[in-house]
Amino acid sequence: QPSVSPGEPSPPSIHPAKSELIVRVGNEIRLLCIDPGFVKWTFEILDETNENKQNEWITEKAEATNTGKYTCTNKHGLSSSIYVFVRDPAKLFLVDRSLYGKEDNDTLVRCPLTDPEVTSYSLKGCQGKPLPKDLRFVPDPKAGITIKSVKRAYHRLCLHCSADQEGKSVLSDKFILKVRPAFKAVPVVSVSKASYLLREGEEFTVTCTIKDVSSSVYSTWKRENSQTKLQEKYNSWHHGDFNYERQATLTISSARVNDSGVFMCYANNTFGSANVTTTLEVVDKGFINIFPMINTTVFVNDGENVDLIVEYEAFPKPEHQQWIYMNRTFTDKWEDYPKSENESNIRYVSELHLTRLKGTEGGTYTFLVSNSDVNASIAFNVYVNTKPEILTYDRLVNGMLQCVAAGFPEPTIDWYFCPGTEQRCSASVLPVDVQTLNASGPPFGKLVVQSSIDSSAFKHNGTVECKAYNDVGKTSAYFNFAFKGNNKEQIHPHT
């Protein structure tokens, strides 16, 4: 019993003056609280509480369920307690069969004893099964048995409290331990697609998958920079214990341009939060944007190859693509493919392969593409660079020597005179007349140039060279002069 210095309020005294009392079942419990300022008796066992305002607590025929802590409290709020065991051979344990534990915390198996003199008070697995090797427990006859540091692996563990009474092992009713997991990581969140492109009026639907150890994970779809609550639908599954999955699907049945933006799937648990975003772009109608991968004006040498390459964005997806030249459609020599295999890809590539181009194959090559909303095209102007070709070299009736050459780019014609039989003609002769013959003709193909000189200027035997050249190469034609007396006997042109 408590002792205090005089003058200070003191706790009540209890008779019998013991901390514990053992009573046989059926016998009387008689407890007296001695205090001038008596207020009440309180009885507690498991989660049950009873009160009595009389200073004497009397239970005429004690039962096992009268086992528990009896506390007397005075008007100063001071109290004294006695613990009473009601020994009942037929009921060794008082039990509250609900058993929940939080992972990594201790939990109490509530099976207080009605007889403190039994031995081997412990836990046993149901149906003779052993307890997990790492399960540690601490028995307390007045409270029950504490399991230390509960593990997830103990979830749904079936167990009994056990004690030896007069040499025999006695088991309590069974307990099923339910373990609540500790959140040791943030939820795992993922989204069905990172970006969406839609036309006005189309349905927007996106699914966020949230994975965690418990269904008590919080999740929501949010629109960035908006507080509006979004309508979402859920599906959820337990793929076994501590393996929970939720699918939160956000739907806008008829998307509008102003629905465009970033949508965030946010999830959190007691450990922390995670989020993932998806971007929605709503356009009023479809589009096609073409990007040439090479210059749209192409110069290529005769006999060489060239690839005309475009990339284009098309939404909705392209339905028809074609390459055209001179109103003719290519059936082969081209390929069209998506830039990536990604489901949300809107970028494509088209390539036209032109091989061993001839001078006559210059011109406009057009790529056309269409989808259900729009058409688009792009033109490439292809110029074939050709070495000049001398088409004609003649002495005209008026005594002029004329050279006509064709090539691309436009050839330049120079004239040279070689006296005697020299092969190297160095002295240049100025032309009398130079004309580009097809300047007003088609814009592609060879350009024809005509140049003339006056042959009367030549007084000696020799050779005249007509030399046509451009960036690609050069070609020459020759006129031979032979004089007999004062007359030009012959002019023999040759290349």
Epitope: S214, S215, V217, N235, H238, D241, N269
Partner: antibody, heavy 119, light 106 residues
Amino acid sequence: QVQLVQSGAEVKKPGSSVKVSCKASGGTFSLYAISWVRQAPGQGLEWMGGIIPAFGTANYAQKFQGRVTITADESTSTAYMELSSLRSEDTAVYYCARGGLDTDEFDLWGRGTLVTVSS
Amino acid sequence: DIQMTQSPSSLSASVGDRVTITCRASQSINSYLNWYQQKPGKAPKLLIYAASSLQSGVPSRFSGSGSGTDFTLTISSLQPEDFATYYCQQGVSDITFGGGTKVEIK
């Protein structure tokens, strides 16, 4: 033994809300899953949602999403279910039960609260 | 949602009869199936959890079996206090109950 004690019967007008309470008389209330299950006259059982008080986040059946709010007060070991925008078809006995989340079975039931919705 | 289909919806039997009630899930629910008994004006009472585990205090004449999609509740010898309505319930997805089986006296 633990008991779940529910609040008394209610009569409500269409369009209004009702809040039913469920007090647990002991045990580790914070770790319980407390669910709400309703039963219309002569009909079967319908899960509305539930909460584990220690975790604080409620789960709701799709049908009741946005119309039901389940909360728990650990200090008083009491769970609450509020149902808004009541209509006549919400007339039912509303049970609170221990279990129903994270694969827990319903091993303990309250006695039920009759909610009548009538104009 | 996972649909739970109970059959039959009602049955008449006599004391001492063996009674079998079946429950089929619209998709696999492993063994996350529970059985309840409900008497008029009372709350349901858990009989079987995890498809086949008998709840404490429930007589051993009640037994459960099955996994995946098909489950059975068996009452080996029907007693007068067993006349009631029985419900199955799955716990894999949002919780759903079967429509109930009413066991009546023949």
